[in-house]
């Protein structure tokens, strides 16, 4: 109840001189607090900026290709706890991009030892039409890549509730959510706990029995009556995502070699690629079986390396 606001009448008293002295002291205190507040706000802003910058440094955006999955078998759970969650894990390895500059080429051999041999010889004379071109073979300096496991758990006991209206105090809203989600008429069931966050207007409802969450999730919305107004809150599966075995790796490619020194060539890239391929196929040139050649004579190209 509103701190007895309606229960007691406030009596106004005449001010004594002592009270005015107190007022002056209070005014000074308020000014001091206000200054401190401004100072703290500035500090918070500064720290928030630093935090944002730090966060950006540790963010990785990767376009992960779509993967086709093969369904192998049905597992018979040993106990009920295995039924309370659906879990799956994905191994994610990022491809490492490398920019091939103008006048450069990348050549990938089938065997590592061939690549190593080409690099150790360093200088190679390649016949390109009527020009005998000296190219330099170097290891490919790669940026770091990442490898990690994404572990996803979809709960069969919990649900997420969003778009909860901010119409009640926190304790009352918790009660109201539990009450509403326990109604079997709407597919609900006995509620174990409610974790409600008023600020975000969301909650996590944990049920006592398996299967209740599934029933509720058959619909995307759920009715919540507050003072005769029916609010429709949004329900969605509760998932927990963990990042595991996060590894950052770097190094040089074992089968791919960087060729430089072709800046002056004005020819079709595909023709040059064929000529490089022919040259490095020959054992007498220190080469061997070639997998692929990618050449850049105009615009730089991006090549992606994977494990």
């Amino acid at each position: 109840m509103e701190a007895d606001k309606d229960d007691t009448q406030q009596i106004l008293k005449e001010h004594s001189p002592d009270e005015f002295i107190k007022d002056e002291q209070n005014k000074g205190l308020i000014d001091e607090i206000t200054k401190k507040n401004i100072q703290l706000k500035k500090e918070i802003q500064k720290l928030e900026t630093e935090l944002q910058e730090a966060t950006k440094e540790f963010q990785i955006k990767e376009d992960i290709p779509e993967t086709k999955m093969k369904f192998l078998s049905v597992e018979t759970p040993e106990n009920d706890s295995q039924l309370s969650n659906i879990s799956c894990s994905f191994q994610v390895s990022s491809k490492v991009p490398y920019e091939i500059q103008k006048g450069q080429a990348l050549i990938t051999f089938e065997k590592e030892e061939v690549a190593q041999n080409v690099v150790s010889m360093s200088k190679h004379h390649v016949q390109i039409k009527d020009v005998n071109l000296e190219v330099t073979a170097k290891p490919v300096p790669l940026n770091s890549g990442v490898r990690f496991q994404v572990y996803v758990e979809v709960s069969k006991m919990k649900i997420n509730v969003t778009e909860i209206p901010d119409t009640l105090r926190e304790d009352q809203m918790r009660d109201k959510l539990e009450l509403s989600f326990s109604k079997s008429r709407n597919g609900g069931g006995e509620v174990d706990r409610v974790d409600y966050d008023r600020q975000s207007g969301s909650a996590v409802i944990t049920f006592v029995e398996i299967g209740v969450a599934d029933k509720i999730l058959k619909k995307k919305e759920y009715p919540l009556y507050i003072n005769q107004t029916c609010h429709r809150v949004t329900v969605s599966p509760y998932t927990e995502i963990h990042l595991k075995k996060y590894q950052i790796f770097s190094g040089t490619s074992k089968r791919t070699v960087l060729l430089t020194g072709m800046e002056g060539i004005q020819m079709d890239e595909e023709i040059v690629e064929d000529l490089i391929n022919i040259h490095f196929q020959r054992a007498k040139n220190g080469g061997g079986e070639v997998d692929v050649v990618k050449c850049s004579l105009g615009q730089p190209h991006i090549a992606y390396f994977e494990e």
Epitope: M1, E2, D166, T167, L168, R169, D171, Q172, R174, D175, K176, E178, L179, S180, S182, K183, R185, E190, V191, D192, R193, V194, Y225, I226, N227, Q228, T229
Partner: antibody, heavy 124, light 112 residues
Amino acid sequence: QSLEESGGDLVKPGASLTLTCTASGFSFSSSYYMCWVRQAPGKGLEWIACIYAGSSGSTYYASWAKGRFTISKTSSTTVTLQMTSLTAADTATYFCAREYSYDDYGDFWGFNLWGPGTLVTVSS
Amino acid sequence: ALVMTQTPSSVSAAVGGTVTINCQASQNIYTNLAWYQQKPGQPPKLLIYGASNLESGVPSRFKGSGSGTEYTLTISDLECDDAATYYCQSSLYSRIADRANAFGGGTEVVVK
């Protein structure tokens, strides 16, 4: 389904007393608030406090009862009311009541189950 | 605080007659109003919830109506057994205060 209050007694002013409400035929669930209501001799009904019977166990008090009265859920079938610094004005029959949610299509409530009451007399 | 004001404090009517009891809330209670009947030495009995919904087992002679802050209980075809004290009550969820609960002062119905 029934409720029964116990613990009513004749006590001196300033004393403390704990009343217990025991439910039979049902156990507390998310659809109820368990409450205490009192009635002074020859007077009307006066709400004291409620506790949510669901998992949160939220408590709500009448403004005059805050600080002196404490409602608690001690099991899935019992609720207590602790009263301190009792005065003659607290002399009354104390009822335990179940406030039920009729919220099939609205936010409706009603005390649909009452105990017979227990008498508390504060006198020197 | 939620305050329920009930009028009149006492009313008398003959058997077969009709009585009307009024209840005014200090704020909008969104039809979340209940009516109770109490006989001496007994606990109250719920008659109506949600302003107009009859609790099971309660005769249809009891009729509740109203909205917002004004509510009415009408008892028609009065019977001797209807002699009792009647109370209105409401509980209200709130965004700024505790969940409040309040009873009206009661109306004594005398059947002649």
